[in-house]
Interface confidence: low
């Protein structure tokens, strides 16, 4: 039986149940390399409190569909008096990166995970030539996730002092030059995640091989190497390599660009100070507010919620978008889809799509950007569920009683982008990170 998601096969992935202090190791194609879980465990549960291990999914007892992977075991469990077996269930959804398995919940018998990943898409529109896991858990089981930094097209220009060369990088995956026509990146070879441009020539100086690593609580490292043997003539016989160190800043700050800190014989060392290197709970909330000791800021967007069935309306040329954020009020047009953002075709108002649902909400404040994301909308042909990304700007003189109004700015691959100037996006900082 062929592996169902080959892009995910090369790695053992991790997920965490934070409430119960449980670390799961998952290998969807083979077995995890943990002796205590036995030789054929595909999902190994590590109970950190008791320092015990249990296999909750056997690689031999795998069943797969396009969107669901189940690993059974031979271990009995008692659920409502019936004799079940312990199993793990992973639901796959189309995503724009390899993504991360997320622990959802566990019963006595079943451990549930959800995974938004390119591997589950119906088309290969988001697939990379080469991509590696882009998240890590620190020793306190806090998740550091660089997936939001991954560029699906184009690349980041590294800040260095050499006027003759430009070093471009992507995070955790190769640079997609196909989607970035007309730029100097067009010359970059397929597969490169670090591309050195000199004049009209471009050189592969590194491809992703291993996933993200944590070296200290607030320092993450990503290494790229040039895979094929051929040496570059300007490298003095050395093989090129790139090391990117992502640093979580000691206090809240605006984003910075990656900086070249050392260069010798085509070995490039880059440091990138970014809040995306901090643990995810520092950056994100599932509610419409971010506050408390952990986040160093006070943000509350809940006053933007509309009551009484009214919605914000944003004009998108062919479509009208109805938005109702930070609440669970149904949008009238959206046919009980539980949509926070609803897309209606102007020429045919019966064509209605949920562009993100209110129970799939993430508020993120990172590198000075405040973003509200709604995902899990109606599927596009690629299998990707429509989502909306609302970028907020502080405006103390915003109209509509300070609330302002969302403005549609564009769509890329079934992700809808809005900007919203409002006084409620003005962030209050605390200083004790």
């Amino acid at each position: 039986q062929a592996a169902p998601f080959p892009e995910l096969c090369s790695y053992t992935w991790e997920a965490v149940d934070t409430k119960n202090n449980v670390l799961y190791k998952i290998n969807i194609c083979g077995s995890v390399d943990i002796v205590q879980c036995g030789p054929s465990s595909a999902v190994c549960m590590h109970l950190l409190k008791t320092r015990t291990y249990h296999s909750v999914g056997d690689s031999v007892l795998r069943s797969a569909t396009r969107s669901l992977l189940e690993f059974n075991t031979t271990v009995s469990c008692d659920q409502q008096g019936t004799n079940h077996r312990v199993q793990s269930s992973i639901a796959f959804l189309c995503g724009k990166t390899l993504g991360t398995p997320e622990f959802v919940t566990a019963t006595e018998c079943v451990h549930y995970f959800e995974w938004r990943t390119t591997a589950a898409c119906k088309k290969d529109i988001f697939k990379a030539n080469k991509e590696v896991p882009c998240y890590v858990f620190d020793e306190e089981l806090r998740k550091h996730d660089l997936n939001p930094l991954i560029k699906l097209s184009g690349a980041y220009l590294v800040d260095d002092s050499d006027p003759d060369t430009s070093l471009f990088i992507n995070v955790c995956r190769d640079i997609d030059t196909l989607r970035d026509p007309g730029s100097q990146l067009r010359a970059c070879p397929p597969g490169t995640a670090a591309c050195l441009v000199r004049g009209h020539q471009a050189f592969d100086v590194g491809q992703p091989r291993d996933g993200l690593k944590v070296v200290r609580k607030d320092r993450l490292v990503l290494s790229y190497v040039r895979e094929e043997a051929g040496k570059l003539d300007f490298c003095d016989g050395h093989s090129p390599a790139v090391t990117i160190t992502f640093v979580c800043p000691s206090e809240r700050r605006e984003g910075t660009i990656p900086k070249l800190t050392a260069k010798s014989n085509c070995r490039y060392e880059i440091e990138w100070i970014t809040e995306y290197a901090c643990h995810r709970d520092y950056l994100e909330s599932k509610t419409c507010s971010l506050s408390g000791e952990q986040q160093d800021v006070s943000i509350d967007l809940t006053p933007l919620a509309q009551s009484g069935g009214s919605s914000y309306i944003s004009d998108g040329k062919e479509y009208l978008f109805y938005l109702n954020v930070c609440g669970e009020t149904e949008i009238q047009f959206c046919n009980k889809k539980q949509a926070a953002v609803c897309q209606v075709k102007k020429s045919d108002t019966s064509q209605v799509k949920a562009a993100g649902r209110y129970h799939n909400q993430t508020l993120r404040y990172s590198d000075g950007d405040l973003t509200l994301i709604y995902f899990g909308g109606d599927e596009c042909s690629s299998g990707f569920q429509r989502m909306s990304v609302i970028n907020f700007e502080c405006n103390k003189t915003a109209g509509n009683d300070g609330k302002g109004t969302p403005v549609f700015t564009g769509e890329v691959d079934c992700t809808y982008f809005f900007t919203w100037d409002t006084e409620y996006a003005c962030v209050h900082h605390h200083h004790h990170h």
Epitope: P6, D124, K127, R179
Partner: nanobody, 116 residues
């Protein structure tokens, strides 16, 4: 049985043309990204062209403007039209399919020789 079968190779004079075909069976062809690669004697396999399932086409610098990749989903076939052939285009040409749910699939290859 999932497989790819190349055809259309042969001996051609410099400046001549060929059209290579790659027929796929056992896969949902339209969901796959299709690539052409080539391997000259004693050299590493090199990428030639890509046609993504959503329509993007891209080419190696060495063939840009001379080669064209296309597909016919009704025939489950991808083509590589090669014009203005040069001796350095001599190689075995392989097609590859990359799908969301299967391992990459390679064909057996077809020989192209450009010589006067």
């Amino acid at each position: 049985q999932v497989q790819l079968q190349e055809s259309g190779g042969g001996l051609v004079q410099p400046g001549g043309s060929l059209r290579l075909s790659c027929a796929a069976s056992g896969i949902i062809f339209s969901d796959n990204r299709m690539d052409w690669y080539r391997q000259a004697p004693g050299k590493q396999r090199e990428w030639v062209a890509t046609l993504a399932s959503y329509g993007w086409k891209t080419y190696a610098d060495s063939v840009k403007g001379r080669f064209t990749i296309s597909r016919d989903n009704t025939k489950n076939t991808v083509y590589l039209r090669m014009n203005s052939l040069k001796p350095e285009d001599t190689a075995v040409y392989y097609c590859k399919a990359s799908s969301p749910v299967l391992n990459d699939i390679w064909g057996q290859g077809t020989q192209v020789t450009v010589s006067s």
